[in-house]
Each structure stands twice: as C-alpha cells, then as structure tokens.
C-alpha cells in the first residue's frame, strides 16, 4: 500500500568514475520499523517469483548480516526515517537505477533513484545574467550537480586563463531536495572585458584540473573614443588652423551618432569624425571632446585643451578695498586676459609708472595718504604688451588732520565780551560733517565749525574743538585768557585777632580772590574819604573816632571792584561822663528832679553807680536818679560812675540846688 511509505530524495544523482555518491534520503514506514533493506542495481520485478531480480549492492537482514563485498556501499539510515546511502568509490557501471527494497513486518516497498555516472568528470555550468553593462555589478554563477562528503572538489574562476582577483563564494547542497556545488562571483565588468573568455574550472582537492565551462563576455558599453589633435600640444596662435580627429576604439552595440563639444556645449553642424578649425580666434580656446552614441548611451573622449595664445587684453584694476582707512591693508589686482598668462606687470599711479612692483597683485600692508589716486596697470606676455585699461580709484580715508581751535576776537578778551572761535583743520577724508566742543556750554554755533560765546565768563579758561568725519580729531585746548576786574573783594581784619579795644594797633587787609591782569591798585575809603592806597590799612593806636564803615576798592586795567562796607567797631571804657539835671540844676523843693548819667561807651554802660558830695554811694544803679519830691537837704554835688566790659569811668561833680518854696518862706 503505497500510501504507507513516503520517500524524499533527489530524483537523479550525478557522479563520475572514481568519485563517490552521497544519496540524502528520508522515508516514513507507517506500520512500524524497518526490518529488511536491500539496495538493488537495476531491479526488475519477477512476476513468477513475486520478487525483484538484480544486482544486490547492499543487503541488511534481521540478523544484521552484510556480505563483505558490500563495504563500497553504505546504508547510513535507520529503521524508521533515514535512508541515506553512500557509494565510494562509484564506478561507471553503477549508472542506472538504484532500487531500495524496504520491508517492515507487514509491508514492502521498492523506491527507485537514478544514478548517472560518467566516465570523466562532467563540466560545471556557467550562468550569466541576460545582459551585462559596463560598470554595473553582476553575479556570475558556476553550478555543478555534484557534491559528496568523501570527495572534496573546488571551483575556480579564470578570466582569459588568469585567476580572477575577486573573491568567489562557494556553497554546497546535500539535501533531499538537491545535491550541487555552486560558486558565485560578484564582478563589475569594464568595457575592456567585452569579448573576453571567462572560465569556471573544476578541480580536485589538490587543485588538479577535472573539467571546465567557458563563456564569452558580451559587455554592453558606450563607445570608447580616442581624440587626436594637430598640432599635438594643442597650443596655437590666433589665425592658425587646428584639426581634431575622433577614433572609436570600441562600441557595443555599434555607434549611431557623432558630435563635438566645446566646454561641455555641443558644436552645431559638426557631425563627422573630423573637426577642422580654421583661422582660430582666442574665443575658440577651451576644452574640446567628441561624443559618439550607441543604444547604451553617449561616450565621450578625453578633453583636449586648445590654447589659442594672444597678447594681453587691456587690463583693469581691482582694489580690495576702497575706500581704505589710512593704516589698513589694501590689495591691488591687475586683471588682463592673456595666453599664456602675463609674466610681467607695470603699475601706474595717477598716470605715472610706479617702480618696484611687477607682480599681478600688489599688497600694501598699511596704506599711506599718498597712496590715494587712480591705479592702472599693463600686462605683458611672450606675445606682447597689453594696453592700459581704465583705472581704479583708491580713496584713502583718515580723520581730520592738524585740528586747531582759533580765537577770532582781538585780544585780550574781557569778561562779558562775545567770543567767536573757529575750528580749523588741515585736511580730512571724508569731509568734516560736524564739530564738537569742550567744555559743553549753552553756546550758539552760528555756522559749522564756529562757536559764539555771548557774555564770556571770567572763568572760561580753555576751549577745545574736534572736527569729525567718520572719526573725531581733537585740537589742543586753547586758553581764552579772559581778563576781568578783581573778584570777591572784601575787608579782612588781620590784627588784633580778638575785639578791637581803644588804643590797640589795628591792621585791615583788602583781599580779592583773583584778578586778570594780575597788576592791581588798592583804595581805602571811609565815609567817602580816601584813606590809603595800600593793600593794608594800619592804625598804630585806634581811637573810638576811628570806628565806622570802611570800604576798599581794587582795580586793574579792566575795572574796579569795591568790597562790601565793613564796620570797624572800637571798644572803650565809659568816657565823657557827666551828670545832667532836669529840669535844671536849681529846683524848688517839692518838685521833681531827675539826674541823668550821660556817657560815651562801647559797649554801652551796663552798670551805673551814684555818689553824693560825701562820695557816699547811693542805692540807685540806673542811668537816671529821680528825686521826688525834692528836698532842700538834697542840695549838693553829685557824680556818677559808669561800668562796661572794658572798664569804668566817672563824671565830674554836678551841683543840685534846691530852694525853698514860697509857702515855706511864708511860714517862716
């Protein structure tokens, strides 16, 4: 019952005389374990005997006996799933059908496997992709339907008989599905490989040749070209002729069109293999190549650089950078089309030839003011000297130079004058656009660079200006030297250091803070009267009569200044004391009499004492002594004493006469 036996193995196995065969095989006997196995060579069923006839290559029975001649053939299987076989060595007459007769307790099966043994090693087979294009990687495959554990082999790739450098990957398969040895080679063919022979060589383990397969490469590629030029160096002068020829060294498939290119651009109406250029001009200098196309694409030749030589063209100057700040670096570049390149340059500044520089580039590390101007140049090569083209302007910029502050007024300047100053400079680039002044003040600038100071102060000492373009340059400060009358005139007491007492030596100083000019005169005045012309006013022995309001005047050529009035105060003890009587020195009894102690004192009398004709002090201490009612016995001589912080003074005697009233006389 066939449904009970399932076999898997290659349908046919290939080998050659002396090699070996390894037959991978699996089976499934559904009704139990294998009890008997016979390997037949070309088995034939005998209907009469109901058995198979044929050469028995291997036999395994229940008792496990195997004939000794069966050692060449090995059953490597087992009783239930593996039926792998090995024949080593294999012989030519092993070709044919192998029959695997399998018997279990209840079932039998004959499985057939084809064996193809050749006399000599058969060749491998090279497989190529359908199309090969240059520079596109392809995989070359060499396949041999053989592999056996007992017989190692190798596959080697050759190109035109020479081993290929690329590393091949060899793989083997010994499975129930397939038995083979395969070598794969990755390879990027070039156009030059077209038509070349590739060989896959089968070798034994010692590298001995067994067989091979060869193929011829068909590498599709764009046309490969060679360009030839007359003259060969491609260097000509204007007016000469040039011939270029394009030769196709290889093309697969055949080429279809031809064209010529200059500097990458196609030349019109040039579709032959020869390009003729007659009476060339410098514009025809450039890189030439020919282009030939086939179905793969266009192929280009190497470029030929055609140099049409000519004398330099009129030159131009490029300046890096203008305008330039004085002290900065500047580079001049002389640009002139010429072939060959100019070997010598002549530089001009403002039309005059400049010596010392013959290079294309002139580098000035730190620019100077006289470098400003127009620069031009002339280039020279072996064919001649060019012309001077238009010049380039170098603008050298710098801050205003030699800035000065100038006083426009006639000198000297007096306090209160209107002063006009101007800010002058020698040169400036760019132009001066504004001015600055120090110190800052509420002054007017009637015009650019002019400063007007109305009512100039005595203390306006120096003024400085700056002229400004992109930078400001300051002038040295100029002294206004303003002249003015003496200032801050005041009277100062030098001695004594304390209060002035009558009889003291006194010195007064006339002080002032400043004067310009310095030469001054002094005047002392009291109550409109001139006292002296020195800076000091001296009193050897001051008297109270010297007290009063003093002023000093200081004058110079500009004017005079008076001090504030200064009060001179003389301190003295009470003096000129006298007793005055009111209503008179003769008073009728019963009336009122007032005695007043009059004095001259500084400070004023602070304490009075009254005395009678007996020099007896009276108990009265005010300036006035009031007697009311006055009595006859009050008659007599009185005097008073005055006291202040300086001292005392006394009056002379003054007599008071009190006479009787008519009533008193009448009573008598």
């Amino acid at each position: 019952d066939s449904s009970k036996w399932v076999f898997e193995h290659p349908e046919t196995l290939y080998a050659w005389e002396g090699a070996c065969v390894w037959i991978p095989c699996t089976y499934r006997a559904l009704d139990g374990d294998l009890e008997s196995f016979i390997l037949f060579h070309n088995p034939e069923y005998n209907k009469n005997t109901s058995k198979f006839d044929g050469t028995r290559l291997y036999e395994s029975t229940k008792d496990g006996k195997v004939p000794s001649e069966q050692k060449r053939v090995q059953f490597l299987g087992d009783k239930n799933k593996n039926c792998t076989l090995s024949i080593h060595p294999v012989h030519l007459n092993d070709s044919g059908q192998l029959g695997l007769r399998m018997e279990s307790k209840t079932e039998k099966w004959m499985e057939r496997i084809h064996l193809n043994v050749s006399e000599r090693p058969f060749p491998p087979h090279i497989q190529l992709p359908p199309e090969i294009q240059e520079s596109q990687e392809v995989t070359l495959t060499c396949l041999l339907n053989f592999s056996c554990y007992g017989y190692p082999i190798q596959l080697q790739w050759l190109l035109e008989g020479v081993p290929m450098r690329q590393a091949a990957v060899t793989s083997t398969s010994l499975t129930i599905k397939s038995v083979f040895t395969r070598s794969e080679l990755k390879f990027s063919p070039q156009w030059s490989h077209h038509g070349k022979i590739v060989t896959c060589q089968l070798q034994d383990a010692d590298g001995k040749f067994l067989s091979n397969d060869t193929v011829q490469l068909n590498v599709k590629h764009t046309p490969k070209l060679e360009i030839k030029v007359t003259p060969s160096d491609a260097i000509v002068r204007e007016g000469d002729s040039v011939t270029m020829t394009c030769e196709v060294s290889s093309s697969n498939p055949e080429y279809t069109t031809v064209s010529w290119l200059k500097d990458g651009t196609s030349l019109k109406k040039q579709n032959t293999f020869t390009l003729n250029l007659r009476e060339v001009t410098k514009d025809q200098s450039g890189k030439y190549c020919c282009q030939v196309s086939n179905d793969v694409g266009p192929g280009r030749s190497e470029e030929v650089f055609l140099q049409v030589q000519y004398a330099p063209e009129p030159s131009t100057v490029q300046i890096l950078h203008s305008p330039a700040v004085e002290g900065s670096q500047v580079e001049f570049l002389c640009m002139s089309l010429a072939n060959p390149l100019p070997t010598n340059y002549t530089w001009y500044h403002n039309g005059k030839e400049m010596q010392g520089r013959t290079e294309e580039k002139v580098h000035i590390p730190k620019i100077l003011p006289w470098h400003a101007g127009t620069y031009s140049c002339v280039a020279e090569n072996i064919l001649g000297t060019g012309q001077r083209g238009p010049g380039a302007e170098l603008d050298v910029q710098y801050p205003p130079k030699k800035v000065t502050t100038v006083i426009q007024n006639p000198m000297p300047i007096r306090e209160g004058d209107t002063v006009t100053l101007s800010c002058n400079y020698n040169s400036s680039n760019p132009s001066v656009t504004r001015y600055e002044w120090k110190p800052h003040g509420a002054w007017e600038e009637p015009s650019l660079g002019v400063l007007k100071i109305q009512n100039v102060g005595w203390d306006n000492t120096t003024i400085a200006c700056a002229a400004c373009n992109s930078w400001c340059s300051w002038a040295s400060p100029v002294a206004l030297n303003v002249q003015y009358a003496p200032r801050d005139v005041r009277v100062r007491k030098i001695k004594p250091l304390s209060e002035i007492h009558s009889g003291n030596s006194v010195s007064l100083q006339c002080d002032f803070s400043s004067s310009h000019p310095k030469e001054v005169q002094f005047f002392w005045e009291k109550n409109g009267r001139l006292l002296g012309k020195e800076s000091q006013l001296n009193f050897d022995s001051i008297s109270p009569e010297d007290a009063g309001s003093y002023s000093c005047w200081v004058n110079n050529s500009i004017g005079q200044t008076a001090s504030k009035a200064w009060t001179l105060e003389v301190l003295y003890a009470p003096r000129r004391l006298r007793v005055s009587m009111s209503p008179g020195d003769q008073v009728m009894e019963g009336k009122s009499a007032t005695l007043t102690c009059e004095s001259d004192a500084n400070p004023p009398v602070s304490h009075y004492t009254w005395f009678d004709w007996n020099n007896q002090s009276l108990p009265y201490h005010s300036q006035k002594l009031r007697l009311e009612p006055v009595k006859v016995q009050h008659s007599g001589a009185y005097w008073c004493q005055g006291t202040n912080s300086v001292g005392k003074g006394r009056s002379p005697l003054s007599t008071l006469t009190v006479y009787y009233s008519p009533e008193t006389i009448g009573r008598r």
């Epitope: 004085e326 002290g327 500044h349 403002n350 005059k352 030839e353 400049m354 010596q355 010392g356 520089r357 002139v362 000035i364 590390p365 730190k366 100077l368 003011p369 006289w370 470098h371 710098y398 801050p399 130079k401 030699k402 020698n426 040169s427 340059s473």
Partner: antibody, heavy 119, light 107 residues
Framework: EVQLVESGGGLVKPGGSLRLSCAAS????????MSWIRQAPGKGLEWVSY????????YYADSVKGRFTISRDNAKNSLYLQMNSLRAEDTAVYYC????????????WGQGTLVTVSS | YVLTQPPSVSVAPGKTATITCGGT??????VHWYQQKPGQAPVLAIY???DRPSGIPERFSGSNSGNTATLTISRVEAGDEADYFC???????????FGGGTKLTVL
C-alpha cells in the same frame, strides 16, 4: 646704478639763504617721490620735506615750514631745497633721498651736503 | 608723535642684538629701519616692519605690534656696529618721524 649727488651747502649767516640741489641718475627720476632729510652734527636723523613724483603733493616738517621750499625739475632730473631765514639750529648735513612709493621708506640716500649757519 | 629708542645696545659677536622702537600704537604704522655707519649715509635695513631689501643679510629681521617695533640682528658681526634709526609716517601730522637712534656696539 642709482646715484644722488647733493650740492649747494656751505657757511651762511643767520637769517641768510641757501639753495641745495640734488642731481639724480641711474633711475627714472620722474617716477619717484623724493625727500630731504638732515642730520645735525652728532645727532639723529630729522625729516625735512617730501615731494611727490609730479610735484603736486608736498609735506614739510613744522621746524622748517614757511622758511624752506622743496621743488623738482623732472626734465633736469633735479631736486631742490630753497632755505630762507636760516637759523643756527638748521646746521646739519642735508641728505637728498629717494622714497619707495609703496612702503614710504627711503631706499637710496645721497652722501649729503653740510650746511653751517653761524655768525 | 614720538619714537623712543634705547641710546645704546651692546652685544658679543655671534649673539643676537635686539633694538626696540617704542611709540603709541606703533603696530598700526609701517616701520622702517636704517643702518648708518660712521661718516656714511644711512642705508635701508628693513622696510614694511619686516621686509628685507636685497643686499641686507638674512640675519636682519623685524617685527612690529602693539606699542613696540623690534629690529633683531642674529649672529652679530663686527661689521654690524653702527647707528640704527627707526622711522614711521605720523598720519595725524603728515610728518615722517625718526627715532633718536641706537648705537650698536659689538664687544
């Protein structure tokens, strides 16, 4: 060979005048800026005046401004220095010098002529 | 503008001499150096801070930055004994300015 030869020096009284000349040869005189530089006996170098190749640009030291005048005659390959109101402090060896336009340095000097201002 | 040079510098033969030239922000200016031997006119030794005219030995070199320019003479020889002057263009006054000079003595 570049040559600069000064002449015109000598003894002069204070307040007097002298005209120095410099004859140039061995180079294209009209292409070069020129200077006068002086050196008082035993002292250092002092720049006096400078003139551009065409004569359009002229600079003077403050110490001589208003008294000295630089000029040139390109046709005669000559440089001049007119010195007026001479003072004792103007006593020096006066060098005629060729300037390098590009760097401003003095690349050639004459041998100098001595000017003595004394009463 | 004032250029300050040391009055004298002494150096042994074969050694290196350094002569300085000081000035405010001198690094922004072109500095030139002149050599003057007794009784002779000056000779340009260095221009553009560090360039050497033809005929001046490679032993002579210059540098300039900040507030100091320097003339360096390596492997000094007896023939280098001379006065050395630095020079700049003062753009604020439009004047050439020379340093006071340095007397180089070879010991």
């Amino acid at each position: 060979e570049v040559q600069l030869v000064e002449s015109g020096g000598g003894l002069v009284k204070p307040g007097g005048s002298l005209r120095l000349s410099c004859a140039a040869s061995g180079f294209t005189f009209s292409d070069y800026y020129m200077s006068w530089i002086r050196q008082a006996p035993g002292k250092g170098l002092e720049w006096v005046s400078y003139i551009s190749s065409s004569g359009s640009t002229i600079y003077y030291a403050d110490s001589v401004k208003g008294r000295f005048t630089i000029s040139r005659d390109n046709a005669k390959n000559s440089l001049y220095l007119q010195m007026n109101s001479l003072r004792a402090e103007d006593t020096a060896v006066y060098y005629c010098a060729r300037d390098d336009f590009w760097s401003g340095s003095v690349d050639y000097w004459g041998q100098g002529t001595l000017v003595t201002v004394s009463s | 503008y004032v250029l300050t040079q040391p009055p004298s510098v002494s150096v042994a033969p074969g050694k290196t001499a350094t002569i300085t030239c000081g000035g405010t922000n001198i690094g922004s200016k072109n500095v030139h150096w002149y050599q003057q031997k007794p009784g002779q006119a000056p000779v340009l030794a260095i221009y553009y801070d560090s360039d050497r005219p033809s005929g001046i030995p490679e032993r002579f070199s210059g540098s300039n930055s900040g507030n100091t320019a320097t003339l360096t003479i390596s492997r000094v020889e007896a023939g280098d004994e001379a006065d050395y002057f630095c020079q700049v263009w003062d753009s604020s006054s439009d004047h050439w300015v020379f340093g006071g000079g340095t007397k180089l003595t070879v010991l």
